[in-house]
Interface confidence: low
């Protein structure tokens, strides 16, 4: 099916850049690695490049105003043509949950004192209003809290005296038209509107005032245009050249509204001053090799030596990496395949260790799962051995960083009947739903 | 991954004062050594000092007498004060940390902050 073809793909906010134009096939759009497509119903972006996992989202808003509570964020496996690891297919979301709170404390209620006095008329004739307060402090509401219903009420009072009305001028008229339309007549152009004393009129009895002020109001009319000229598009010119040199680009064809210029105001061509074709080179670009992640370090050995662990002898150790991804022509991978470094084997050592400070508190796991819960830990950590954290293996090469290699095994003092890890694992609260921010979006 | 993070580096006269700072954070259980290194131009890099979990210190003999290093275990952070700075001590200083958990160990080096006493 055609889809929407874009130039770029903006990782952090997950969306196509650039329309390039619709009508193509995601394997044409997918030529390029930089580009993007999506589908024509309003679905997701989708980058050209090989599948892998999208940036995190911001957190979720805690699931409750107050106390503690939870919130998740996302991520989506996103790209074109396989999947981001074995069995998790393009468009699979990945969650994680963590414990929030908003606000420590939940607003309480107050609760409202006796009604104060009523306050004197708000006028001096005819009817008006009065009022009367409470206070909100018996008792203060907490945390944020208020008091249910009005701080005031008022009701309506009469002082049994009959008011004057005085004259007010009503709303101005509409501005009356231009006598002319352009400049250069016979009668300089102007404009008239008018009011009214009815909003309202004065009294008789006792006697209004009348309103201040003209009833009329006249004035020059100013920016009128010389007549107008419509303007008019020219030819198309040629067609540009394709501006790539593989996968898919774009044309421009150009016109000028000159036939004639738009001239004292007049409106000008409508339409557009361009418009553009998709051209396909229907070569495939260039994609450069990329390192994929070193492997693991190997054992750590000294020539000639069966075994150097637990032994103040440095060794070696080597890790590889692999330049995966280079296809048609795209440069290969700067820098060295290989790793060397110096070591100490500590593997299997039996060490002195120590108890670590408890960890803080990790993600709630499993996040969509039931019953999600956080933990921390304890670790009985080795104590490292004292060997010179340098060495000078060849004359003349200088002093070479030397890394501890290897699991050891540390031995603490037991606590709460461990020897190794001691974990404490905790409930999290109000875990909202995982659902599906596309989907949320409908 | 953990971050290793430098500051404090900066321009002294000959005799003057300076603090240099740095931090170990991210997923991190406890740094059991942390150490201060320099290299100046066209040198190997050397160790200047080092402090182990439990406040054990080693000095290079270019630096004793003029250069304390301390720690905060708790906060993951060492600080080298260094006093009577002579014009040698310019160099690229880096803080150096080693982690060890129950996975393995492992060694961490920040990017290094520029020291230069001029006379």
């Known amino acids: 099916d055609p889809v929407l073809c874009f130039t770029q793909y903006e990782e952090s906010s997950g969306k196509c850049k650039g329309l390039l134009g619709g009508g193509v096939s995601v394997k044409d759009c997918c030529l390029n690695t930089a580009y993007a497509y999506q589908e024509r119903n309003g679905g997701l972006c989708q980058p050209c490049r090989s599948p892998r996992w999208s940036l995190w989202s911001t957190w979720a808003p805690c699931s409750v105003t107050c106390s503690e509570g939870s919130q998740l964020r996302y991520r989506r496996c996103v790209g074109w043509n396989g999947q981001c690891s074995e069995r998790v297919a393009l468009g699979t979301l990945e969650w994680q949950l963590q414990a929030c709170e908003d606000k420590q404390c939940c607003p309480e209620m107050g609760g409202w004192s006796d009604w104060g006095p009523w306050e004197p008329c708000s006028v001096t004739c005819s009817k008006g209003m009065r009022t009367r307060r409470r206070a909100c402090d018996h008792p203060a509401p907490k945390c944020g809290g208020h008091c249910p219903g009005e701080a005031q009420e008022s009701e309506a009072c009469d002082t049994q005296q009959v008011c004057p009305t005085h004259g007010a001028w009503a709303a101005w008229g509409p501005w009356s038209p231009c006598s002319g339309s352009c400049h250069g007549g016979p009668h300089e152009p102007k404009e008239t509107r008018s009011r009214t004393c009815s909003a309202p009129e004065p009294s008789q009895k006792p006697p209004g005032k009348p309103c201040p002020g003209p009833a009329y109001e006249h004035r020059k009319c100013t920016g009128l245009p010389p007549c107008p000229v419509a303007g008019g598009w020219g030819p198309w010119g040629p067609v540009s050249p394709c501006p790539v040199t593989c996968g898919l680009g774009q044309t421009i064809e150009r016109r000028t509204c000159n036939r004639p210029v738009p001239q004292h105001g007049g409106p000008s061509c409508a339409g557009d001053a361009t418009r553009t074709h998709i051209c396909n080179t229907a070569v495939p670009c260039p994609v450069d090799g990329e390192w994929d992640l070193w492997g693991q370090w190997s054992t750590c050995v000294r020539r000639n030596m069966k075994s150097i662990s637990c032994e103040e002898i440095p060794g070696q150790q080597s890790r590889w990496r692999t330049c995966k991804g280079r296809k048609f022509d795209g440069h290969r991978c700067t820098g060295q395949q290989q790793d060397i470094r110096h070591c100490y084997s500590i593997q299997h050592c039996p060490l002195k260790g120590s108890w670590s400070e408890w960890s803080t508190w990790g993600l709630c796991m499993p996040p969509c799962g039931p019953n999600p819960t956080r933990a921390r830990q304890r670790l009985c950590t080795p104590l490292l051995p004292k060997y010179p954290p340098t060495v000078s293996m060849v004359e003349g090469q200088g002093e070479k960083n030397v890394t501890f290699w290897g699991r050891p095994l540390p031995r603490c003092e037991e606590l709460q009947g461990q020897k190794l890890v001691v974990e404490e694992k905790r409930p999290c609260l109000h875990v909202p739903a995982c659902k599906d921010p596309e989907e949320e979006k409908l | 991954q953990v971050q290793v993070v430098e500051s404090g580096g900066g321009l002294r006269q000959t005799g003057g004062s300076l603090r240099l700072s740095c931090t170990a954070s991210?997923?991190?259980?406890?740094?059991?050594?942390m150490a201060w290194y320099r290299q100046a131009p066209g040198k190997q890099r050397e160790l200047v000092a080092e402090?182990?979990?439990?406040?054990?210190?080693v000095y290079a003999d270019s630096v004793k007498g003029r250069f304390t290093i301390s720690r905060d275990s708790a906060k993951n952070t060492v600080t080298l004060q260094m006093n009577s700075l002579k014009s040698e001590d310019t160099a690229v200083y880096y803080c150096?940390?080693?982690?060890?958990?129950?996975?393995?160990?492992?060694?961490?080096w920040g990017q290094g902050t520029q020291v230069t006493v001029s006379s």
């Open positions: 150096n940390a080693l982690q060890y958990d129950r996975y393995g160990g492992a060694e961490y």
């Open positions: 991210g997923r991190i259980f406890e740094v059991n050594m």
């Open positions: 402090i182990s979990r439990v406040g054990t210190t």
